[in-house]
Every structure is written in C-alpha cells, then in structure tokens.
C-alpha cells in the first residue's frame, strides 16, 4: 500500500515513515499490515483468500497377480513399466470413476511379490469451510472402492478375467494427507500483535480476515459520524468535530452542539 | 506401446480358406496375443488367444476352424481360418496385452492394444 508526497515536506516525510515502512523517493512503502501517509494507519481488512482447491493423497499398497514382476518394472523409463502404468491407471480409472474428488493415481514404486504396487490416490475439491468432511467421505470411498474390486478381481484357476487381478490380502491404506487451509490460523498470523482483534468471516462461502473496522460484516464496529481506527488496545472511534457540533462516546454517538458550550462559556465570563 | 499392423483379408467364397497375419513393432514374446473381429453392426468379440506361453483359446463360433499361432522371431500372429462361412464376414482386428501379462485364458480385458484391422467378406 502507498501514498503518494508531493512538495518541499517529502524529505522530512522519508524519515518519519513508520511501522517498517521505506521511503522510495516519492512516499512511503507500506508494510503489508499498514497503510497512510506515513503507514500509520493499520488496514482493517488481510486478504487471505483460500486456495480455489484443496488436495488430499492417500498412500496405498495393491498386489497385482495378473502381471509377472521384472526387474524392468524397477526402470520408470522401460516399456515394461510405461505399459504397466497406462494399465494400472486405466484399471484405477475405472475402479473410481464415481468418485467427483478423484484425480488419478501415481505409481511411486514396484517391487516383487506378484506385483507390489505403491501409489498414492490423489484427490482435489473446491474450496469450501466444508472441504475436510467432502475429503474424508472421498477417501472412505475410495478405500471401499479398491477393497471391492480387489476382492472381486482375483485369479481363479490361473485365469484372469479382467484387465487385471489382485491379492485380495495385499491391499492396505498406508497414509493419508490432506492439505491444511486454516483461515483463522492464517488470519491470526497475518494479523501480528493485532491478532487478537481480527476475526473471519464468511461472506458466500468465502473467508475474510477483518477487524471491527472495517464496514459491513456482523462485528463491523458503527463509529457513526466518526473514523474506526485500530490500536495495539484494540479499535477505537475517532470522534470528528464540525462547525456545529463536537462528538464524543464510544462510538461517537453523543453530540454536543457548540453554540450551547460557547453560551456557556460567555455567561461565566 | 506396440504398434499392430494387419494384412491378408480379402474377398471369399463360403468353404474356401484364409489367412490373416498381423506384424507386430515389438516383441511379442512377452505377450498375450489375440485376433478379435466385429461384424457390421454388431459388438466386436473375441475369436482366439495365445498366451505367451503358448496356450492358445477359440470362441465356440470358430473351434476347429480357425488356428492362432505366432512366430516370435519374425514378431508375428497369425489366423488360419478354414471352411468360411458367411457369418465370418468382419473386420479382423489383432491385439496384444501389454508385457508379461499373465492369466491370458480369456478374450477379453486382457488386449489392450489393437491394429487397424482387415477386412473379410465370405459370399459366393
């Protein structure tokens, strides 16, 4: 955030910007935090707009029976391995198609035993404050999923009838990761020492770190006539003074007509 | 990724004989190798299979008709067909599994590449 100086006062500006602020030659480089003339005012709004999508990874092991174990498999780059993967994810493809979070799979190794096949299931959602519960029923489906079709899909006779077979006892779920998105953590942080007075709010579906000072949302501080200024002591009303009137009170609410304090003050004189 | 290419299709009179061969870019030694044919407005089948091992399966439509053999050396599959009949009009297409596939007893999933296909047509 910047303001702009003009005029013989912009050298005696440089040095006085405050709060971390640096001067360019022309005004005050504002620290994220602030903003003013002299960056000594503090925003009443962070932006801490939410990743549009958030992600989860699911670890997990399948024997594959249907294919014999080379030691090509080992080489990412062999056609052994390219042909296993375009398979393995075809099959994958298929077994989770029902499943609107699933993305694909990525095979991180093979190794003897059949076929042991370590992927993770990748998954992705659409931010919303709901994003943890639409991930975890993801990932309770996807194990139901492969837990069925690695029942299903086994060799009977030395016969495989599917595009591929498994054991249905080397199935396992080794690890799940979901990416952490904490708006109030994230709002709190970037806050600093003002942190105990910013909180989020959802305005549709969106998050938005705001102090008291800033207009529009239910903890929106009414300082009426006055300015919301932020304090280390929290936000303050500003109370203005016009021609007629002075104001005063917390909220700047209680107005006392000058004309009444100025006949005041002539009747004592 | 193996590449499929078929020839030896052709017009036919009904009894008479054929045969199909379909050369292959890679090796196909390590594979399951099949020919599967789809008839003009119907679903394409299987007609037979050989597993890498040699073990070969027909569809009932075509046992004691046809014969699938392979030749490693020359990275071939090939189908003779005897005693055509009419309801053998199709496209031939070849196809292979992908490397040490296993279990190759059926026609179906296993075969995941295909070639273009050539055409046979049985009519007097």
């Known amino acids: 955030r910047t303001t702009t100086c003009f005029g013989d006062g912009c050298q005696n500006t440089a040095s006085r910007c405050k709060n971390g602020g640096t001067w360019d030659g022309l005004k005050c480089q504002c620290p994220n935090l602030y903003y003013g003339e002299l960056c000594e005012e503090v925003v009443s709004s962070i932006d801490i707009g939410p990743p549009e999508t958030i992600s989860a990874q699911m670890e997990l092991t399948v024997t594959v029976t249907s294919v014999k174990f080379t030691e090509e498999l080992k080489n990412h780059s062999s056609q052994e391995f390219q042909e296993f993967k375009q398979t393995f994810t075809e099959q994958m493809n298929i077994v989770y198609s029902g499943i609107p979070e699933y993305v694909g799979v990525n095979i991180t190794k093979l190794r003897l035993g059949s076929v042991v096949v370590e992927h993770d299931v990748l998954l992705r959602t659409k931010y919303t404050p709901e994003y943890k519960t639409v991930l975890d029923n993801a990932t309770e489906v996807v194990k139901e999923k492969i837990t069925k079709v690695t029942t299903q899909q086994i060799m009977i006779n030395d016969i495989c009838s599917d595009m591929m077979c498994f054991n249905t006892t080397g199935t396992q779920v080794q690890n799940i990761t979901v990416t952490q998105y904490d708006p109030e953590e994230d709002c709190r942080k970037m806050a600093k020492e003002y942190g105990d007075y910013f909180v989020v709010e959802y305005r549709d579906q969106k998050p938005y770190c705001i102090s008291p000072c800033e207009p529009g949302f239910s903890v929106s501080k009414n300082c009426n006539l006055g300015k919301c200024q932020m304090s280390l002591s929290g936000p303050q009303c500003l109370c203005v003074t016009t021609e007629t009137h002075w104001y005063s009170g917390e909220t700047c609410n209680q107005g006392t007509q000058k004309s009444l304090v100025y006949g005041h003050h002539h009747h004592h004189h | 990724e193996v590449q499929l290419v078929e020839s030896g299709g052709g017009l036919v009179q009904p009894g008479r004989s054929l045969r199909l061969s379909c050369a292959a870019s890679g090796d196909i030694t390590r594979r399951c190798m099949g020919w599967f044919r789809q008839a003009p407005g119907k679903e394409r089948e299987g007609v037979a299979g050989?597993?890498?091992?040699?073990?070969?399966i027909y569809a009932d439509s075509v046992k004691g008709r046809f014969t699938i053999s392979k030749d490693n050396a020359k990275n071939s599959l090939y189908l003779q067909m005897n005693s055509l009949r009419a309801e053998d009009t199709a496209l031939y297409s070849c196809?292979?599994?992908?490397?040490?596939?296993?279990?190759?007893?059926?026609?179906?999933?296993?075969?995941?590449?295909r070639g273009q296909g050539t055409m046979v047509t049985v009519s007097s």
């Open positions: 050989i597993s890498e091992d040699g073990i070969t």
């Open positions: 196809a292979a599994s992908i490397l040490n596939r296993v279990g190759c007893r059926q026609l179906s999933y296993e075969y995941i590449y």
